[in-house]
């Protein structure tokens, strides 16, 4: 015989769940023991069966889970899974916060990405700081020339996707350019999107020829300027 224990504690590390109103929330407390334990759920210390909740709840005992769809502010609280058998019991608390802020288009920090000048062979980092209520997705684009033109017949620029990423809110997204050459020079765009819309800002990368060390030593006062 064995008291209940968590089988996947790493899946329970996210204690605070802050989700936008209307989203689905799933709490899991995967456990085992001998005899096989049962699971009960409490909300703010009281037995929770979801009977007073519009839309109810889904309890999937074989998955040790509680699912609530279309959460509303009244769903806020502490949710406790109580796992017990004849030998003992264990419990774990989840905190649910339902966010009511109006989700908006991603906001990009002014001045990022920044115009940058680099020397051939050097490494470059372009930064993009995104603020978004909904989880944003990011694309780094390079504006390219096709048949001698930067724009198509529709007036829109030709772009090439360099990198795509899904990031958490308020993270800094970085585009790394290693060992840059003259071909890397040009306009780069950080495009951020979420369920509400897209926002994007651009910067120029200027790539200078490799400095001749003898020329630099002989004429230290001569320097490239923007």
């Amino acid at each position: 015989q064995q008291a209940p224990y968590w089988t996947h504690p790493q899946r329970m590390e996210k204690k605070l769940h802050a989700v936008p109103a209307g989203n689905t929330v799933k709490f899991r407390c995967p456990a085992a023991g001998n005899p096989t334990p049962t699971i009960r759920w409490l909300k703010d210390g009281q037995a929770f069966h979801g009977e007073n909740r519009i839309g109810g709840i889904r309890l999937r005992h074989q998955h040790w889970s509680l699912v609530m769809e279309s959460v509303v502010p009244s769903d806020r609280g502490t949710y406790t899974c109580l796992v017990e058998n004849a030998v003992g019991s264990i419990r774990y608390n989840y905190l649910l916060d339902v966010l009511e802020r109006s989700p908006h288009r991603p906001i990009l920090q002014a001045g990022l990405p920044a115009n940058t000048t680099a020397v051939v062979g050097s490494d470059v980092e372009l930064l993009c700081k995104v603020y978004s209520d909904a989880q944003p997705h990011i694309q780094w684009l390079k504006h390219i020339v096709i048949n001698g033109s930067s724009f198509g017949a529709d007036g829109f620029p030709y772009v090439q996707v360099l990198k795509t990423a899904d990031i958490n809110s308020s993270e800094v997204e970085v585009l790394y350019l290693r060992n840059v050459s003259a071909e890397d020079a040009g306009e780069y765009t950080c495009l951020a999107g979420n369920s509400i819309g897209l926002s994007y800002q651009s910067a120029w990368l200027t790539v200078l020829p490799e400095e001749d060390p003898t020329w630099t030593a002989a004429a230290p006062e001569a320097r490239y300027t923007d």
Epitope: P20, G22, N23, T24, S102, P103, H104, R105, I107, L108, A110, A134, Q135, H137, Q139, L141, D154, F156, P157, V159, V161, T164, T189, L191, G193, N194, S195, I196, G197, L198, S199, Y200, Q201
Partner: antibody, heavy 124, light 112 residues
Framework: EVQLLESGGGVVQPGRSLRLSCAAS????????MHWVRQAPGKGLEWVAV????????YYADSVKGRFTISRDNSKNTLSLQMNSLRVEDTAIYYC?????????????????WGQGTMVTVSS | DIVMTQTPLSLSVTPGQPASISCTSS???????????VYWYVQKSGQPPQLLIY???NRFSGVPDRFSGSGSRTDFTLKISRVEAEDVGVYYC?????????FGGGTKVEIK
């Protein structure tokens, strides 16, 4: 041709449920957020809900929060709206609308393509 | 929520004459990326809305150049330089900067 086609409307009693569907074609459905907008008879337009391209984010108008659920099946190019606890004031034409895509916006980033709409009448 | 207020409620125009519709938002629609997220639609009888203008002043593909959008921050205008019979319908402005997305109450354009 880019198209959105709604279905599932009908007459239903207050308190009952209805499920609307929207079939998308002519574009990469899984790359776009999708919205529902409704219009009560003789009235203006009211935004109802949005779902992100992968279904991970959903937002609702206060008037339907807790009663309506937006969902999508990218494998079937289908958007759905599950409407529970229907009220007389939910009577409207429901439009499926394409939202923002994931790539560079060659034109508007959404709200450019609308379906023909499906009529929902809630009446006792 | 952002409130969109449209004027006038209705408009009766002689063909070939100009028409102007105003829309005011309760908050600025100028976003950090420099764009102003106001859209204009026309809804003809028995049809879904059709996009005319996006991001304040950009004409959607296929929209005649007699339609133009202008304004800044909270005050917006849709102009039809020479109204034609096919322009009858209800015109709506919409803010597309945050949820809930909101529409103006509509302006009904009729031909004299």
């Amino acid at each position: 041709e880019v198209q959105l086609l709604e279905s599932g409307g009908g007459v239903v009693q207050p308190g009952r449920s209805l499920r609307l569907s929207c079939a998308a074609s002519g574009f990469t459905f899984s790359s776009y957020a999708m919205h529902w907008v409704r219009q009560a008879p003789g009235k203006g337009l009211e935004w109802v809900a949005v779902i992100s391209y992968d279904g991970s984010n959903k937002y609702y108008a206060d008037s339907v929060k807790g009663r309506f659920t937006i969902s999508r099946d990218n494998s079937k190019n289908t958007l759905s709206l599950q409407m529970n606890s229907l009220r007389v004031e939910d009577t409207a034409i429901y439009y499926c609308v394409r939202g923002a895509g994931r790539g560079f916006p060659y034109g508007p980033d959404g709200f450019d393509i609308w379906g023909q709409g499906t009529m929902v009448t809630v009446s006792s | 929520d952002i409130v969109m207020t449209q004027t006038p409620l209705s408009l009766s125009v002689t063909p070939g004459q100009p028409a102007s519709i105003s829309c005011t938002s309760s908050r600025s629609l100028l976003h950090s990326d420099g764009k102003t997220y106001v859209y204009w639609y026309v809804q003809k009888s028995g049809q879904p809305p059709q996009l005319l203008i996006y991001e304040l002043s950009n004409r959607f593909s296929g929209v005649p150049d007699r339609f133009s959008g202008s304004g800044s921050r909270t005050d917006f205008t849709l102009k039809i330089s020479r109204v034609e019979a096919e322009d009858v319908g209800v015109y709506y402005c919409m803010q597309y900067i945050e949820a809930p997305l909101t529409f103006g109450g509509g302006t009904k354009v009729e031909i004299k």
